[in-house]
Amino acid sequence: GPVPPSTALRELIEELVNITQNQKAPLCNGSMVWSINLTAGMYCAALESLINVSGCSAIEKTQRMLSGFCPHKVSAGQFSSLHVRDTKIEVAQFVKDLLLHLKKLFREGQFN
């Protein structure tokens, strides 16, 4: 059957932990992505930011997992209003910020 939302979120959190702890060199060669507002619709916005990073195997699983939380198809070059379009940050910082926010969502029972 389908994976419960709580399990899916926990698995996403654990994948982000793995990414942050396995950094030997700069994540995705120091690629920059648009910062996002960590609010409703945040999963799609996060995917829209990360999907523009190509050739980075470290975040491919994260991209796939985020797509499971986003109700519509996301493709490169697509942007929502949730992006802070004047602020770009390194993928590593983006992942750390997203991880902390997801841990708080998990605590609050916001699994979707």
Epitope: T20, Q21, L99, K103, R107, G109
Partner: antibody, heavy 122, light 108 residues
Framework: QMQLVESGGGVVQPGRSLRLSCAAS????????MHWVRQAPGKGLEWVGV????????HYADSVKGRFTITRDNSKNTLNLQMNSLRAEDTAVYYC???????????????WGQGTMVTVSS | SYILTQPPSVSVAPGQTARITCGGN??????VHWYQQKPGQAPVLVIY???DRPSRIPERFSGSNIGNTATLTIERVEEGDEADYYC???????????FGGGTKLTVL
């Protein structure tokens, strides 16, 4: 100001019972999860258990499960810890602690009482 | 049940930086809180949610949480920082709150 005041500590024989109380003031008691934490002399902190804001759920440390019961009376802003079948290893300072309530009780303990000493000895 | 491992003691000279670690399996997936306890007193929250600081706590205190290790960092250590420090997480698999064993910070 916001305050938690424990009472009911003392010396008790092994196998006997004791009831601790905690009076809360200065904040909206019914909106907080409430925990008990204990500290044996010269030892570290040990979580005892939690009761949710509305009293609907309790969780206990394995070391006290089946012997200790946490209750609360939101109309009187009081938290209780009923301790039965006490053992020497239950000797400790017992702290009443509050934590904001979410779906999980994973919030930090932002207010502590001064603690009350429980000594289990024959 | 979930286990948090802290070094029993850390020593540092005044003005230097103290780092107190808290190890746990994939602790980075959990929200970590830190408490300071001075002799004869109740613990005080110094860091919550990995890296947030209560308003009354000096900026010298900071926290991080990556992989299997959370770290409490105290910069420009003062004699008044000498205390026991405890990390804490909620283990959602057992519905238990868990404390580390505590670390005694000694200011030389």
């Amino acid at each position: 100001q916001m305050q938690l005041v424990e009472s009911g500590g003392g010396v008790v024989q092994p196998g006997r019972s004791l009831r601790l109380s905690c009076a809360a003031s200065g904040f909206e008691f019914r909106t907080y999860g409430m925990h008990w934490v204990r500290q044996a002399p010269g030892k570290g902190l040990e979580w005892v258990g939690v009761i949710w804001d509305d009293g609907s759920n309790t969780h206990y440390a394995d070391s006290v499960k089946g012997r200790f019961t946490i209750t609360r009376d939101n109309s009187k802003n009081t938290l209780n810890l009923q301790m039965n079948s006490l053992r020497a290893e239950d000797t400790a300072v017992y702290y009443c602690v509050r934590a904001p309530q979410w779906y999980l009780t994973a919030e930090a303990f932002d207010l502590w009482g001064q603690g009350t000493m429980v000594t289990v000895s024959s | 049940s979930y286990i948090l491992t802290q070094p029993p003691s850390v020593s540092v000279a005044p003005g230097q930086t103290a780092r107190i670690t808290c190890g746990g399996n994939l602790i980075g997936a959990k929200l970590v809180h830190w408490y300071q306890q001075k002799p004869g007193q109740a613990p005080v929250l110094v860091i919550y949610d990995d890296s947030d600081r209560p308003s009354r706590i000096p900026e010298r205190f900071s926290g991080s949480n990556i992989g299997n290790t959370a770290t409490l960092t105290i910069e420009r250590v003062e004699e008044g920082d000498e205390a026991d420090y405890y990390c804490q997480v909620w283990d959602y698999s057992s519905d238990h709150m868990v404390f580390g064993g505590g670390t005694k910070l000694t200011v030389l």
